[in-house]
């Protein structure tokens, strides 16, 4: 019977032979035939000989061919096929016979060994994946592992082993992504061949065309568009262009791949047209495709016959900004091609040379950190030299300034000044701003609070009243005036409020405003009837047994928590001792008074007495000290004894009894041992030290005695007063 397919001398689908042996394979068929060999067997190999088909078999009507492979090697393992040569009349399906030859070698269980660098195997999730670790013997047991320590075990369904093909994974998943290795142990020796599965994705991350749209060119120039497609590492793309001249193949297109990025692939397609013409203007589209993924990017190309410049104001010709702004953009509306050279002038000079704060950005001049110096005329100069085109346009910039009050910026005192009661005061605000600010003066009255918990207070947010020279609010105003002055090279307005008579405490405010904003300076106007707002007085230096009387007066707007303390120095440290039984402080119109009375003082009460009050504004405790030295007591003594004395009737006389002692002695007068009281005609002088008798009569004659007494004792002196002449009562009457 005729052989529909060639017949091989080795029967079956596979045959195992040992390495080093000779493979002898004969093919017999009805027609001329050829051999197909594994890729690892080279037709030029000296060890291989194939006889051309020659007549054989019954009646020499068959064709026979012999394949001989001397000293076969492990890598000669594979499929050997004998097939009929196709004829022009033959419409049969391919007629062939194959046998898989295993060239077994214990030293080379794998046909291909990938040890130094793993072999890359592309995979698509959900599709079949073959890890091609083919073996040289069907009996070799192979294990598939995934680095570092997973084992992929054949289950006969999803993962199967085929000694001719390797491991077949029916539908690959992410679990098969990685460094895989096939392991086989032969005669106690471990063999490994490595594969790196590479998942192919269709992820196009980005498509861009450079230069950005619109692309402008002059007739005759070269158009170069670079389309860049960024993809995941495992993505490959096809790139194509649509453009006006595509039908006539106007452009040349070059493609390249940039693999220098560690986590992406970047594909480039560069379109180039030399000597562009009007017909090349229009839409250029770069199309990027990867599997089912597609992205495109458009750019528009304009081709101009010749250059042009047109410039207009983007805003008004006169623009305003404010000093202190982080930046201001002076911008012009420019249409020009090709890109002109740009120079900005400020008041006729190149702006960027004037200040590093001036930056040119496109057709804009950006002024950083605007100041008043930036006011002026700005001119944009535009020039296209090759086209001999030049244009310019000027804009004026006004820099407005929010009002500033100079006195606010100079460091103010931590606590407000005090204005003496009844004094004339001049209050000044020096103001600067553009436009020139309007200045008004305001009055905020103080609110009195007579409760014990709260002190009188003034606040800035209370009701306020606008003042004019005729205002009768608060204090009498002498004048409100304004004058211009140049300070540090700038025009400033000095506004002056003159208070004629300081009587009423409150807050004066000068308010300066223009269209940019308002600023206010508050001047706390605290009137004081106490010198420097804090005064301590001692009635007199007491002697032992007398009363000590101290008085402390503080300005009520500046101080609170008033108290008397006694300072004592112990071991070089000053101790503050509180004094008990202090009286309540009393509040008056402008001040708080605290009196301290210590009755019947002794020498131990000597010391430094201090009045302490807390400054409301600084929180600081202020002390005013006074030294008290209690004088030692001393028995009275007379500076001069009384002496007998004669006086004429109807005359007048003075008896003097000057005594000293500590405390100052009390003086008592006696006449004939009877205490003298002041009565008409008898006058006791200061401290009873003098006795004055007017219109002396006979009855005034007698023994006069003065006694000086204090705690320490008493002393006395006596004298006889003689009245000369007789009394003429009738005449008197």
């Amino acid at each position: 019977s005729k052989l529909k397919v060639p017949e091989l001398s080795l029967k079956g689908t596979q045959h195992v032979m040992q390495a080093g042996q000779t493979l002898f394979l004969k093919c017999r068929g009805e027609a001329a035939h050829s051999w197909s060999l594994p890729t690892t067997v080279s037709q030029e190999d000296k060890r291989l000989s194939i006889t051309p088909p020659s007549a054989c078999g019954r009646d020499n009507r068959q064709f026979c061919s012999t394949l001989t492979l001397d000293t076969a090697q492990a890598n000669h393992t594979g499929l050997y096929t004998c097939r009929y040569l196709p004829t022009s009349t033959s419409k049969k399906k391919k007629a062939e016979s194959s046998i898989y030859i295993f060239v077994s070698d214990a030293g080379s269980p794998f046909i291909e060994m990938h040890t130094d660098i793993p072999k890359l195997v592309h995979m698509t999730e959900g599709r079949q994946l073959i890890i091609p670790c083919r073996v040289t013997s069907p009996n070799v047991t192979v294990t598939l592992k995934k680095f570092p320590f997973d084992t992929l075990t054949p289950d006969g369904q999803r993962i199967t082993w085929d000694s001719r093909r390797g491991f077949i994974i029916a539908n690959a998943t992410y679990k098969e992504i990685g460094l895989l290795n096939c392991e086989a142990t032969v005669n106690g020796h471990l063999y490994q061949t490595n594969y790196l599965t590479h998942r192919q994705t269709n992820t196009i991350l980005d498509v861009q065309i450079r230069p950005p749209s619109p692309v402008r060119l002059l007739h005759g120039q070269t158009l170069v568009l670079n389309c860049t497609a960024t993809t995941e590492l495992n993505t490959r793309v096809q790139m194509s262009w649509n453009y006006p001249g595509k039908a006539t193949k106007r452009a040349s297109i070059r493609q390249r791949i940039d693999r220098s990025h560690s986590h992406n692939n970047v594909f480039h397609s560069v379109l180039k047209i030399n000597n562009v013409e009007s017909r090349d203007k229009g839409l250029y589209t770069c199309r990027v495709k990867s599997g089912s993924s597609f992205q495109s990017f458009n750019t528009s190309v304009h081709v101009y016959e010749k250059g042009f410049i047109s410039v207009k104001h983007r805003k008004q010709p006169v623009q305003e900004t404010t000093a202190g702004r982080r930046s201001y953009r002076l911008s012009m509306k420019v249409k020009a091609f090709p890109s002109p050279e740009i120079v900005w002038l400020k008041d006729g000079s190149p702006a960027t040379l004037k200040s590093a704060r001036y930056l040119v950005h496109g057709y804009s001049l950006i002024i950083k950190d605007v100041t008043t110096e930036d006011a002026g005329d700005y001119t944009i100069l535009l020039g296209i030299k090759q086209s001999r085109l030049f244009k310019n346009l000027t804009a004026t910039l006004i820099v407005n300034v929010k009002p500033q009050i100079y006195e606010k910026s100079v460091s103010s005192l931590p606590s407000p000044p005090l204005y003496p009661l009844g004094s004339r005061q001049v209050l000044t605000c020096t103001v600067y701003g553009i436009p020139r600010p309007t200045i008004t003066w305001l009055w905020h009255p103080c609110h009195h609070n007579h409760s014990k918990e709260r002190y009188d207070f003034c606040t800035e947010n209370e009701e306020s009243f606008i003042l004019d020279p005729s205002s009768n609010l608060g204090n009498r105003i002498e004048s409100i005036s304004q004058r211009m002055t140049v300070i540090e090279g700038t025009n400033k307005t000095v506004s002056t409020l003159v208070v004629a008579d300081s009587q009423t405490p409150g807050i004066y405010s000068c308010r300066a405003f223009n269209k940019i904003g308002t600023v206010e300076r508050n001047i706390k106007f605290y009137v004081t009837d106490v010198p420097n707002g804090f005064h301590v007085s001692l009635e007199k230096m007491p002697a032992e047994g007398e009363d000590l009387k101290l008085s402390c007066v503080v300005n009520k707007f500046l101080y609170r928590d008033i108290t008397w303390i006694l300072l004592r120095t112990v071991n070089n440290r000053t101790m503050h001792h509180s004094i008990s039984k202090q009286k309540m402080a009393t509040t008056q119109d402008y001040s708080i008074t605290l009196n301290l009375v210590i009755k019947n003082v002794s020498l131990e009460d000597s010391g430094t007495y201090a009045c302490r009050a807390r400054n409301i504004y600084t929180g600081e405790d202020i002390l005013r000290k006074t030294e008290v030295l209690v004088r030692d007591s001393e028995a009275p003594h007379l500076l001069q004894n009384l002496s007998d004395y004669e006086v004429s009737i109807s005359g007048s006389t003075t008896l003097d009894c000057q005594a000293r002692g500590v405390p100052a002695p009390q003086i008592t007068w006696f006449k004939n041992n009877h205490k003298i009281q002041q009565e008409p005609g008898i006058i006791l002088g200061p401290g009873n030290s003098t006795l004055f008798i007017e219109r002396v009569t006979e009855e005034d004659e007698g023994v006069y005695r003065c006694r000086a007494t204090n705690q320490k004792g008493a002393v006395e002196s006596a004298a006889y007063l003689t009245v000369q002449g007789t009394s003429d009562k009738s005449n008197l009457e």
Epitope: I117, P148, F149, Y174, K175, I177, G178, L233
Partner: antibody, heavy 119, light 111 residues
Framework: EVQLLESGGGLVQPGGSLRLSCEAS????????MNWVRQAPGKGLEWVAT????????SHAPAVKGRFTISRDNSKNTAYVQMNSLRAEDSAVYYC????????????WGRGTTVTVSS | QSVLTQPPSASGTPGQRVTISCSGS????????VYWYQQLPGTAPKLLIY???QRPSGVPDRFSGSKSGTSASLAISGLQSEDEADYYC???????????FGGGTKLTVLG
């Protein structure tokens, strides 16, 4: 951008516990094995633990076996190491590392988080 | 004591070629791929060589790696001052079932 960010380090007393986290972004976290590597001050790199892509197989260095446990949560793109019975010699900068799939070495590293074990 | 052995230090002048060796055993270097890492002061390690001799993108071709049996080496040609760093070799160890590293080599660029 491919990134690993460790957190959870700090000062702990001997015998105490800490849990370090490593959050991944910018790559296919669930596909690759994750590692923890530590470096004591002035010393070299020391492998601590590795976990496979699915979180089903782990391996720990002998010095930490029984005390440290590596784990991962692929839904959160985060790997962890639970450290118990800490000792002074565990003080180090702890790095987590992975691969983005080309090299299968440690081609992605975090900045590290410092663990100090001291009383 | 590290599983892989590296010299603790190496040095060279700019432009010179330096080689750092790394020796191991059959359970690690011989049967697995060798990786080299560069660690600049105060930073995390960076992969320099993978699969014995391959360079990740961005690593200059002045760096090359090789492996033979149970040893591996890293060569740096045309030495530059920015190459001053610690260099570590690393590989998988089948018996440990984990990664192993060398003790590190401190490379100093002289002058």
């Amino acid at each position: 951008e491919v990134q690993l960010l460790e957190s959870g380090g700090g000062l702990v007393q001997p015998g105490g516990s800490l849990r370090l986290s490593c959050e991944a972004s910018g790559f296919d976290f669930s596909t690759y094995a994750m590692n923890w590597v530590r470096q004591a001050p002035g010393k070299g790199l020391e492998w601590v633990a590795t976990i496979n892509s699915e979180g089903t197989i782990t391996s720990h260095a002998p010095a930490v076996k029984g005390r440290f446990t590596i784990s991962r949560d692929n839904s959160k793109n985060t790997a962890y190491v639970q450290m118990n019975s800490l000792r002074a010699e565990d003080s180090a900068v702890y790095y987590c590392s992975s691969t983005t799939g080309t090299t299968h070495g440690m081609d992605v590293w975090g900045r590290g988080t410092t663990v100090t074990v001291s009383s | 004591q590290s599983v892989l052995t590296q010299p603790p230090s190496a040095s060279g002048t700019p432009g010179q070629r330096v080689t750092i060796s790394c020796s191991g055993s059959s359970s690690n270097i011989q049967n697995n791929y060798v990786y080299w890492y560069q660690q600049l002061p105060g930073t995390a390690p960076k992969l320099l060589i993978y699969f014995n001799s391959q360079r990740p993108s961005g690593v200059p071709d002045r760096f090359s790696g090789s492996k033979s049996g149970t040893s591996a080496s890293l060569a740096i040609s045309g030495l530059q001052s920015e190459d001053e760093a610690d260099y570590y070799c690393g590989t998988w160890d089948d018996s440990l079932n984990g990664w192993v590293f060398g003790g590190g080599t401190k490379l100093t660029v002289l002058g």
